[in-house]
């Protein structure tokens, strides 16, 4: 439909309905985790409200089991935060020791899974070292960005200790994505 | 108008207007805090420039008394950052002193009121301990997410200590909102 | 097109057409920089890569010389995450050596040229003051807002210290823009 | 493993159009950008373009923009390069040849297919 | 586009010798590569990244260079390096080849 610009100006082009309010759109927000078996050196995936609260998904934008279902193909504005919160790091018990000095760190990644390859796609990744000097820390890391992404794509968030992330209030870890 | 996908291929379906330029969206910029009196547990709420420099609110997108006004119901993507800034945070202090190592906090908050309903709901939050070391520190919160909102609801955006926002410049401390 | 929410209700009014999909869009991602020459208190901007991987543009918005092109006039939403990394700050430095205790620091800022004008207009920024007590250290900084571009602006992201960017994953460090 | 496997040799008339197909395996297709690149006999290697699987973006060679077109579908892990307004000096074996990043290089090549321009 | 010129264009080459391959870009480059080519067979990467060794290949390889001015070199010629050797920029579309090097054994 590109060069339409150049249509004189008494000749109005429309276009094929994409209303507005019918695109596919999702915001999660976080629940208590249930510890779950993950493999070792793979980041375990956060479980969401999809429906109570803040929470909802529409026009076939669907959430089971961890997935954000893609229901249409095209660019999408995915997003997250997930707010993290722990105890003195071990990167300040060994600098105290005098072990060497290797920070923790935290991650978030949103990884996209395509049925017809096994291996995932990390479309987003936060990571921050943890090496804080009080007793108790917390903070957020939010992620952001546009993707193509194909009809029947699943999204997820995983996160590198699921034991830190702070699941208290919904407005503190999220994730959502909505077609462009 | 879902399911119109089956509309047969000759049969072109239009949508009713809704031209993305006519759409109400918002972008608000940091000005200098007048101190106000806030109920202790309440966080203040920030005021904001709405139209000059790179700040603007069009096609019905009000800004008035700290709040954004939401002039039609439908999904919006709400946005902000709040740069902090501050001296050796009382954490390091009580550290050094030996008493219980309480970390400080920073905290902003994007709230909707809806006049119908008496208390506000937390829509976002980003907070995060602040335990530095260095005599002076300064720091960002972003936040980002896609709400349901309501003709008439407002917006505003609250901070745990209004001093120490950062309103030098437009560009480290802002707040958005457009329609989807 | 304003007022016509005031048209009879028989009357179906439909919007000259902005299909969705025909919208300038780009995700760019990190690639390894290549040392250059920038001026004194001016910070160096990145390159990206714009059609491998997650990166891709579209729909005339194009990418040459570290810089994205704006097609066409209208409202856009513009991010990015520059993902940082360096060894024990300066900061934990000078305050072990009892010497006064600046932070160092990394920033971000989204800036805008415009050929008409001389002067870069700095869009967004992030900065955070560094003072890491670990031996190395790795933080994000996220930003995203919407601006009002012209026909022939163009963007690019300017960081403090380009030694310091993570250019190992495409999904650490990343910049986008898209027309609303 | 990582396999390319391209469709077969086709003998075509001057002005014709050649499609030739590559099918992916072993690897996720949309994560890796697919080139085409083509071999004149005893001649050097000649990029033709690129096309991303992931976003459907394509950069072609000045070239031969105009002439040829590439293609995907996901669906399949296959990867089409389709060439028109054939001449005789687009006698040649042609290859699909797919990359992660650019500092990786082209990692992965097809078999090769060879079209032959004669009338 | 960047014009990759290499050479020598032909070596021949006695097993066990060092041979010493360069690639010369008409602009500065940032990413190069390097491919072998056997008579009849696809091109293989070698080099990837200026001086990484591509996945399964023997550490006699070896690649360098900056800027405009890259070398790929074979420590030690075995009989079954005889190939046709070509270098690739992909700095600047149209990601170009060089002219190649045909090494011959002895």
């Known amino acids: 439909l590109k060069g339409q610009e150049f249509a004189p100006s008494h000749q109005q082009v429309y276009a094929p309905l994409r209303a507005d309010g019918d695109k596919p759109r999702a915001h999660l927000t976080v629940v208590r985790q249930t510890p779950t078996q993950h493999f070792k050196n793979q980041f375990p995936a956060l479980h969401w409200e999809h429906e109570l609260g803040l929470a909802f998904t529409k026009n076939r934008m669907n959430y089971t089991n961890k997935f954000l279902l893609i229901p249409e193909s095209g660019d999408y504005f995915i997003y997250s935060q997930v707010t993290f919160r722990g105890m003195t790091s071990e990167c300040s018990e060994i600098r105290q020791a005098g072990r060497p000095n290797k920070p923790d760190s935290i991650t978030v990644v949103i990884t996209k899974v395509t049925d017809s390859y096994p291996e995932p796609t990390q479309l987003l990744m936060g990571t921050k070292s943890v090496c804080e000097v009080g007793s108790n820390w917390f903070q957020p890391i939010y992620l952001g960005a546009m993707f193509s992404l194909q009809e029947g794509d699943k999204l997820m968030v995983n996160v590198s200790d699921i034991s830190l992330v702070d699941y208290t209030k919904e407005d503190k870890t999220f994730f959502g994505a909505f077609l462009l | 108008l879902k399911g119109q996908e089956f509309a047969p291929s000759h049969q072109q379906v239009y949508a009713p207007l809704r031209a993305d330029g006519d759409k109400p969206r918002a972008h608000l910029t940091v000005v200098r805090q007048t101190p106000t009196q806030h109920f202790k547990n309440q966080f203040p709420a920030l005021h904001w420039e709405h139209e000059l420099g790179l700040a603007f609110t069009k096609n019905r997108m009000n800004y008035t008394n700290k709040f954004l006004l939401i002039p039609e119901s439908g999904d919006y993507f709400i946005y902000s950052q709040v740069t902090f800034r501050g001296m050796t945070s009382e954490c390091s202090e009580i550290r050094q002193a030996g008493r219980p190592n309480k970390p400080d906090s920073i905290t902003v908050v994007i709230t909707k009121v809806t006049d119908s309903y008496p208390e506000p709901t937390q829509l976002l939050m980003g907070t995060k301990s602040v335990c530095e070391v260095g005599s002076n520190w300064f720091q960002p919160i972003y936040l980002g997410a896609m709400f349901s909102l309501q003709e008439g609801d407002k917006l505003m955006v609250n901070v745990s200590d209004i001093s120490l926002v950062d309103y030098t410049k437009e560009d480290k401390t802002f707040f958005g909102a457009f329609l989807l | 097109l304003k007022g016509q929410e005031f048209a009879p209700s028989h009357q179906q009014v439909y919007a000259p057409l902005r299909a969705d999909g025909d919208k300038p869009r780009a995700h760019l991602t990190v690639v390894r920089q290549t040392p250059t020459q920038h001026f004194k208190n001016q910070f160096p901007a990145l390159h990206w890569e714009h059609e491998l991987g997650l990166a891709f543009t579209k729909n005339r918005m194009n990418y040459t010389n570290k810089f994205l092109l704006i097609p066409e006039s209208g409202d856009y939403f513009i991010y990015s995450q520059v993902t940082f990394r360096g060894m024990t700050s300066e900061c934990s430095e000078i305050r072990q050596a009892g010497r006064p205790n600046k932070p160092d620091s990394i920033t971000v800022v989204i800036t805008k040229v415009t050929d008409s004008y001389p002067e870069p207009t700095q869009l967004l920024m992030g900065t955070k003051s560094v003072c890491e007590v670990g031996s190395n250290w790795f933080q994000p900084i996220y930003l995203g807002a919407m601006f009002s571009l012209q026909e022939g602006d163009k963007l690019m992201v300017n960081v403090s210290d380009i030694s310091l960017v993570d250019y190992t994953k495409e999904d650490k460090t990343f910049f986008g823009a898209f027309l609303l | 493993q990582v396999q390319l496997v391209q469709s077969g040799a086709e003998v075509k008339k001057p002005g014709a159009s050649v499609k030739v197909s590559c099918k992916a395996s072993g690897y996720s297709f949309t994560g890796y950008t697919m080139n085409w690149v083509r071999q004149a006999p005893g001649q050097n290697l000649e990029w033709i373009g690129l096309?991303?699987?992931?976003?459907?973006?394509?950069n072609y060679n000045q070239k031969f923009k105009g002439r040829a077109t590439l293609t995907v579908d996901t669906s399949i892990s296959t990867a089409y390069m389709e060439l028109s307004r054939l001449r005789s000096d687009d006698t040649a074996v042609y290859y699909c040849?797919?990359?992660?990043?650019?500092?990786?290089?082209?990692?992965?090549w097809g078999q090769g297919t060879l079209v032959t321009v004669s009338s | 586009e960047i014009v990759l010129t290499q050479s020598p264009d032909f070596q021949s080459v006695t097993p066990k010798e060092k041979v010493t391959i360069t690639c010369s870009a008409s602009?500065?480059?940032?990413?190069m590569h390097w491919y072998q080519q056997k008579p009849d067979q696809s091109p293989k990467l070698l080099i990837k990244d200026t001086s990484k060794l591509a996945s399964g290949v023997p550490s006699r390889f070896s690649g360098s260079g900056s800027g405009t001015d890259f070398t790929l070199t074979i420590n030690s010629l075995e009989a079954e390096d005889a190939a046709t050797y070509y270098c690739?920029?992909?700095?600047?579309?149209?990601?170009?080849f060089g002219g190649g090097t045909k090494v011959e054994i002895k």
């Open positions: 040849a797919s990359i992660y990043q650019r500092h990786d290089g082209i990692a992965y």
């Open positions: 602009s500065s480059v940032n990413y």
């Open positions: 096309i991303n699987p992931y976003s459907g973006g394509t």
């Open positions: 690739q920029q992909w700095s600047s579309s149209p990601y170009t």
